[in-house]
Interface confidence: low
């Protein structure tokens, strides 16, 4: 973790007495003080003197003294190489330079794996002045490393615009095997080969992978990290971890449950959401998906009358959104309804069967035979025909409507007339002389109106021209003429 | 979160119309029913009737049928009811619910009420 | 139509009591269409209990609910000040959907 407090800036004592004009160069850095952690740039301080240029990671001093003695060139001082250590310990390590103090503005600053370090609370710079040179220790401080911390750090000094570069020290964070692959939970067919993948990282390596299936080790030999599973198969649900081991010890994955893929359960509650004479709307509740998704449904729709022939008639439908309209179904008819839901391993079983009607419609034809014939007599038109076959009636019949059509030279006026549901014929007044009659006929329910029949025409001709012959409309496929009597 | 919010409270005199609605949020509009219960001041609840926004397909109390006419607009999510011919015994604060119709029948989430005052 | 008939129609308990709040249908019903609501003053009914036992999101274990056929009940185990409400019974078995008259739980 990464706390967010300074070192106080005061010398370190790693030397006795006045600071030497050079530092030694086996100088070993503590591992174990605790300093604060956070990243901050280092604050430097140097006396300031005349620059000189320097190429390279090492400084070449142009300017010699009064005495003409050439300066030595400017590098870092060796230090520690690799650092290993476990996770969660505090480590700390400097590197070290002697700078003549001819030299002005000189900055140093950390740097891991090529990137610098901005904002390194643990980063700390001390100075020692001499009268000819200025030794400079620049500490990093880590308080609780964690695998993130490691990598190739170094110090860069800037001198007068040119840069020095100290060797790496390499940081080695050393804990238990870290997971960056688990296996994950999966349904799967039965008896069908799967596999599962396990990959963790140290350091340090290697890491060695042990698999668990119920509580139980698959594999009486590691696996070096990553490492994949092959199940051949299973026949019951079962639950799979992996163990990754290192030198540090052992980190154990999640467990994750395998699914064996089964028909689905049957839906349940089916429900009756809406009748009318020719369609209902259901729905249900989906039963258990059996670990694989609902691909379809199918509607089972048989009528509930015992004199049926049991003819079974299937609607396929979508699984969502759990409701469907039955259509083309006869009117006033009772139905046994059950559906069934398939996932990709089958079908369902039925769901419990349900019983729902029609309501009553509207005829869906028209009466037949209609015959329409002049009784000048009694100047009525007589009207006979034959009532729809029941099953097309699609209700209780309650009466007909009878339309009739009066043309004469340019007039035309229709009437209506209800009759009732025990009649076959109907008698009207002649309205209009010298003129055309035109007759319809439809049944009625309490479902409403159904079609009217085709048009009947009869001339009813001026008073004392009489014309027994009939009109007609013929029944349905028979060709030959209906004989009134 | 599913949220159900209804439009403001309004007064009405005898024989006009009102119109409540109810805009969804925070689920798929058109898979579940939109039910319309009402609460007269100091009484119990009463079913108005639902509507299922894929299709319009409606369902009334027959109480209500032929007064109360529920629509919806699935492209803003939004529910409607509108009572016509309305009479000071329609004094009710007004609910749209969320029906969850698996097997039957129940509100999982409730408007906020719209409180509608029938007076002269 | 299907009546619903909570008892009581008022109750004043104190708190930490176990109260009960029946409610019977006209007509039987499965258990899976009855359900419970809980109102409080000036806010929106709130489902507590569906298909006569299962809690809604939320809802404090010290509610229950049982019964099936005609008569179901809905149970308060260790009663808090905060139960103070109405509650309603439902059914969802036929239209039209109905409720009970309302049960007024007041804490003493």
């Known amino acids: 973790a990464i706390t967010e407090a300074r070192e106080e800036a005061k010398p370190y004592p790693l030397f006795p007495g006045p600071f030497p004009g050079s530092l030694q160069t086996d100088h070993t850095p503590l591992l174990s003080l605790p300093h604060a952690s956070g990243y901050q740039p280092a604050l430097m301080f140097s006396p300031t003197q005349p620059g000189r240029p320097h190429t390279g990671n090492v400084a070449i001093p142009q300017v010699t003294s009064v005495e003409s003695k050439p300066l030595p060139p400017l590098a870092f001082k060796h230090t520690v190489g690799h650092i290993i250590l476990s996770e969660h310990k505090g480590v700390k390590f400097n590197c070290s330079i002697s700078v003549p103090n001819i030299y002005q503005d000189t900055t140093i600053s950390w740097w891991k794996d090529g990137k610098e370090l901005l904002g390194a609370h643990h980063a700390i710079t001390q100075f020692y002045p001499d009268d000819e040179v200025t030794a400079i220790i620049a500490s990093f401080s880590i308080t609780s490393v964690q695998r993130s911390d490691n990598g190739s750090y170094i110090c860069k000094m800037k001198i007068n615009n040119e840069e020095i570069v100290s060797d790496p020290i390499y940081i080695e964070v050393q804990g238990l095997p870290h997971f960056t692959k688990q296996p994950e939970s999966m349904n799967v067919t039965r008896n069908t080969a799967f596999n599962l993948t396990c990959q963790a990282v140290g350091p340090p390596e290697p890491v060695n992978i042990f698999w668990v299936q119920n509580s139980s080790r698959v594999n009486e030999q590691p696996e070096k990290s990553p490492s994949v599973l092959t199940v051949p198969g299973l026949t019951e649900m079962a639950v799979f971890s992996c163990e990754a081991h290192n030198d540090k010890g052992l980190t154990v994955s999640k467990g994750v449950q395998i699914n064996i893929k089964a028909i689905p359960s049957p839906p349940t509650e089916v429900s009756i959401r809406n009748s009318t004479a020719h369609s209902i709307l259901i729905s249900w509740v989906p039963g258990f998906d059996g670990y694989s998704p609902f691909r379809n449904c199918s509607i089972q729709v048989k009528e509930a009358d015992p004199l049926s022939n049991g003819s079974v008639m299937i609607f396929n439908t979508s699984a969502l959104p759990h409701l469907y309209q039955i259509k083309q179904l006869q009117a006033l008819a009772n139905y046994s309804i059950g559906v069934s839901c398939m996932n990709e391993i089958g079908w369902s079983a039925v769901s419990p069967w349900i019983l729902a009607s029609t309501t009553e419609g509207a005829p869906s034809v028209a009466p037949l035979n209609v015959t329409v014939f002049l009784n000048e007599s009694s100047d009525n038109v007589d009207i006979r025909w034959m009532k729809p076959p029941t099953k097309q009636q699609d209700g209780e019949l309650v009466g007909y409507r009878i339309s009739h059509v009066w043309q004469s030279a340019g007039i035309s006026k229709e009437l209506l007339e209800e009759v009732g549901q025990n009649g076959s014929r109907a008698r009207i007044s002649v309205q209009v002389h010298n003129a055309t009659c035109t007759v319809r006929i439809a049944a009625v329910t309490r479902g409403g109106v159904g079609p009217f029949s085709d048009p009947v025409k009869i001339f009813i001709p001026a008073h004392g021209w009489v014309d027994y012959a009939p009109s007609s409309t013929p029944a349905p496929g028979n060709a030959d003429p209906v004989l009134i009597i | 979160q599913v949220q159900l919010v209804q439009s403001g409270a309004e007064v009405k005199k005898p024989g006009a119309s009102v119109k409540v609605s109810c805009k969804a949020s925070g689920y798929t509009f058109t898979t579940y029913d939109i039910n319309w219960v009402r609460q007269a001041p100091g009484q119990g609840l009463e079913w108005i009737g639902w509507i299922y926004p894929r299709d319009g397909y409606t369902k009334y109390n027959e109480k209500f049928k032929g007064r109360a006419t529920m629509t919806t607009d699935t492209s803003t999510s939004t529910a409607y009811m509108e009572l016509r011919s309305l009479r000071s015994d329609d004094t009710a604060v007004y609910f749209c619910?969320?029906?969850?119709?698996?097997?039957?029948?129940?509100?999982?989430?409730w408007g906020q009420g719209t409180t509608v005052t029938v007076s002269s | 139509e299907i009546v619903l008939t909570q008892s009581p129609d008022f109750q004043s308990v104190t708190p930490k009591e176990k109260v009960t709040i029946t409610c019977s249908a006209s007509s039987i019903i499965s258990s899976n269409y009855f359900h419970w609501y809980q109102q409080k003053p000036d806010q929106s009914p709130k489902l507590l209990i569906y298909r006569t036992s299962n809690l809604a999101s939320g809802v404090p274990s010290r509610f229950s609910g049982s019964g099936s056929g005609t008569d179901y009940t809905l149970t308060i185990n260790s009663l808090e000040a905060e139960d103070a409400a109405t509650y309603y019974c439902?059914?969802?078995?036929?239209?039209?959907?109905?409720f009970g008259q309302g049960t007024k739980l007041e804490i003493k």
């Open positions: 619910t969320r029906g969850y119709y698996d097997n039957l029948y129940y509100f999982d989430y």
């Open positions: 439902q059914q969802g078995r036929s239209v039209p959907l109905t």
